[in-house]
Amino acid sequence: EPPTACREKQYLINSQCCSLCQPGQKLVSDCTEFTETECLPCGESEFLDTWNRETHCHQHKYCDPNLGLRVQQKGTSETDTICTCEEGWHCTSEACESCVLHRSCSPGFGVKQIATGVSDTICEPCPVGFFSNVSSAFEKCHPWTSCETKDLVVQQAGTNKTDVVCGPQDRLR
């Protein structure tokens, strides 16, 4: 009876279990009743990082100097290239696909510490009573407007991203 499931590092094809190709190799042909799976090493600047049945290897990431990137760790047949930013610049994400001089803080966050040559911008969430409605690399959270000091009342509550809205007090007739 043909198998319905295979062991680890195998895959099911044509009602039989074939060995997966090891990391660093791609699939050339599936196994048969009489032959093993045929695999080939990835070429220069290519990789596969898992046991696989891929027919094409992945291209190593290119660390584009026009985006401020440089190679932190050269890729192998089993690992991708790791990029980092030029000195004084910062990755925009964990994957480090581009660089910025310094990060900005999103709405709802204020700048706790402005970036320096060695450290990136440090953001902090705006606490209750404060807001930031912009992306910024220097602005702190701003305090909500005090309606009372203007002899007004709060018409709309503030949030971490919006100021309160003040309006006139209801006059007693």
Epitope: T92, V100, A137
Partner: nanobody, 116 residues
Framework: EVQLLESGGGLVQPGGSLRLSCAAS???????EMWWVRQAPGKGLERVS?????????YYADSVKGRFTISRDNSKNTLYLQMNSLRAEDTAVYYC?????????WGQGTLVTVSS
Amino acid sequence: EVQLLESGGGLVQPGGSLRLSCAASGFTFRDYEMWWVRQAPGKGLERVSAINPWGSHTYYADSVKGRFTISRDNSKNTLYLQMNSLRAEDTAVYYCAKLPFTFDDWGQGTLVTVSS
């Protein structure tokens, strides 16, 4: 395509003044926080001054506080840096930059040399 073109640099004596301009195109200038950043010979980038999109909030590095003034004219898509009481240590290439400060968000720079 973002374009930032700085001008106004030059040679000036200590104690003198200069006004730098940065003409912006290729993006909606009024929507962006803008910065002046400088690089002295053989040194890293130094953040000099910043201004929010509406010109209501500004930032100055301690080294230029009280001497430099940042401003913007959103109707002309232009950023300015008025530099007074210039010192030898202000000698640098001055760049204007926009959020989010990627490699594309920079001008070519204008050289300011303070020397007697």
